[in-house]
């Protein structure tokens, strides 16, 4: 039994890091493998993650961590029974993938303006809370070409757009994702999408 692709991990910079790797053949990850992880700090415990399958030879483990700080470094040991297959380390602050924003809502009751709001996925005491920027994706269910991205570079988790920038009388969907420039993070996963029917009064033409 050998590791084909070494574990790579990303942290949500809050409480969970996710590690994925591939073995050299079909593996029952949960019965055959264990990933031990330990904060490099005096008197910290070595926790054990039981991996789950992620495709035939792929495994995934969710590491549960304290509130992360930038100096944190973890040792990782991948075991098959008493055989050490791989040894490495992981610094969560250098591999951050933010949590996905939640509670995306489209408010259509503001005259001729669409207000999209969502929730910051971090509590106020987390460093990323004040460092997230967002991308909002809006697309038409009827027309695949009608697909747009709005970059939200301010801190407020909201976006206002004129309803008239979208076609009237058809359904749209929106989703939002986040990233943090300060840690050069990857983008989060997209939030669940929300759907609304776009309708607004066309202005009377002046003759």
């Amino acid at each position: 039994m050998k590791v084909l692709q070494e574990p790579t991990c990303v942290s949500d910079y809050m409480s969970i890091s996710t590690c994925e790797w591939k073995m050299n053949g079909p593996t029952n990850c949960s019965t055959e493998l264990r990933l031990l992880y330990q904060l490099v700090f005096l008197l910290s415990e070595a926790h054990t993650c039981i991996p789950e399958n992620n495709g035939g030879a792929g495994c995934v483990c969710h590491l549960l961590m304290d509130d992360v700080v930038s100096a944190d470094n973890y040792t990782l040991d991948l075991w098959a029974g008493q055989q050490l297959l791989w040894k490495g380390s992981f610094k969560p602050s250098e591999h951050v993938k933010p949590r996905a924003p939640g509670n995306l809502t489209v408010h259509t009751n503001v005259s001729d303006t669409l207000l999209l709001t969502w929730s910051n996925p971090y509590p106020p005491d987390n460093y990323l809370y004040n460092h997230l920027t967002y991308a909002v994706n809006i697309w038409s269910e009827n027309d695949p070409a009608d697909f747009r991205i709005y970059n939200v570079t301010y801190l407020e988790p909201s976006l206002r757009i004129a309803a008239s920038t979208l076609k009237s009388g058809i359904s749209y969907r929106a989703r939002v994702r986040a990233w943090a420039q300060c840690y050069n993070t990857t983008w989060s996963e997209w939030s669940p999408s929300t759907k609304w029917h776009n309708s607004y009064r066309e202005p009377f033409e002046q003759h």
Epitope: S15, I16, E45, L64, D66
Partner: antibody, heavy 129, light 108 residues
Framework: EVQLVESGGGLVQPGGSLRLSCAAS?????????MCWVRQAPGKCLEWIGC?????????YYASWAKGRFTISRDNSKNTVYLQMNSLRAEDTAVYYC????????????????????WGQGTLVTVSS | DIQMTQSPSSLSASVGDRVTITCQAS??????LAWYQQKPGKAPKLLIY???TLAYGVPSRFSGSGSGTDFTLTISSLQPEDFATYYC???????????FGCGTKVTV
């Protein structure tokens, strides 16, 4: 300095109740590990009572013999874990230790306490009339 | 619940001796076994976890081995400060129990 300090032990009558406290210092009792209680009757074996997960989920596990009479809780604002003991009997006389434990996890919701790494000094509970 | 059978319950040894203590689990507990040292009036001290990993600050004369149901703690050369009681701790998440062995008292 990282340490655990138990308090609340003493003499209690059979059938009575007692609440023990375990104050954590040098680390956060709300971080990713279990806080557990272990006891040792005079001249007897060590006996695991139960654990509470210190992270956001706060899940608890108990030894089969402890379910019902013993309850573990926590107050993160005070960095303290408690053991509530009810319907006490003479055989509950023991030194009660608080301990921090590592865990085994599968996914993010299934987390099992494993070995006890850091121990308090213990507090003596005597159940007698 | 699992049962942890520790043997011997006591042993006499001299400084410099090689000492072996065994612990047997009533079911397969993989490598979820730890060893502790306890001195009178003191809390237990972790020596070894995951059957064979030495805890921080523990002298290298202590070693652990085994997996599944049979485990061993070895002290390669007994020192004066090693006279104490030793306990194993087996953890079984399948049965939901953490069970200690009943100890081995090492005396002069």
């Amino acid at each position: 300095e990282v340490q655990l300090v138990e308090s609340g032990g003493g003499l209690v009558q059979p059938g009575g109740s007692l609440r023990l406290s375990c104050a954590a210092s040098g680390f956060s009792s709300s971080s990713a590990h279990y806080m557990c209680w272990v006891r040792q009757a005079p001249g007897k074996c060590l006996e695991w009572i139960g654990c509470i997960y210190a992270g956001s989920r706060g899940s608890t596990y108990y030894a089969s013999w402890a379910k019902g009479r013993f309850t573990i809780s926590r107050d993160n604002s005070k960095n303290t874990v408690y053991l509530q003991m009810n319907s006490l009997r003479a055989e509950d006389t023991a030194v009660y230790y608080c301990a921090r434990a590592a865990f085994v996890n599968r996914g993010v919701s299934w987390i099992w306490p494993y070995y006890f790494s850091l121990w308090g000094q213990g507090t003596l509970v005597t159940v007698s009339s | 619940d699992i049962q942890m059978t520790q043997s011997p319950s006591s042993l006499s040894a001299s400084v410099g001796d090689r000492v072996t203590i065994t612990c047997q689990a009533s079911e397969d507990i993989e490598s979820y076994l730890a060893w502790y040292q306890q001195k009178p009036g003191k809390a237990p001290k972790l020596l070894i976890y995951r059957a064979s990993t030495l805890a921080y600050g523990v002298p290298s004369r202590f070693s652990g081995s085994g997996s599944g149901t049979d485990f061993t703690l070895t002290i390669s050369s007994l020192q004066p400060e090693d006279f104490a009681t030793y306990y194993c701790l087996g953890s079984s998440y399948s049965t939901g129990s953490n069970i200690f062995g009943c100890g081995t008292k090492v005396t002069v």
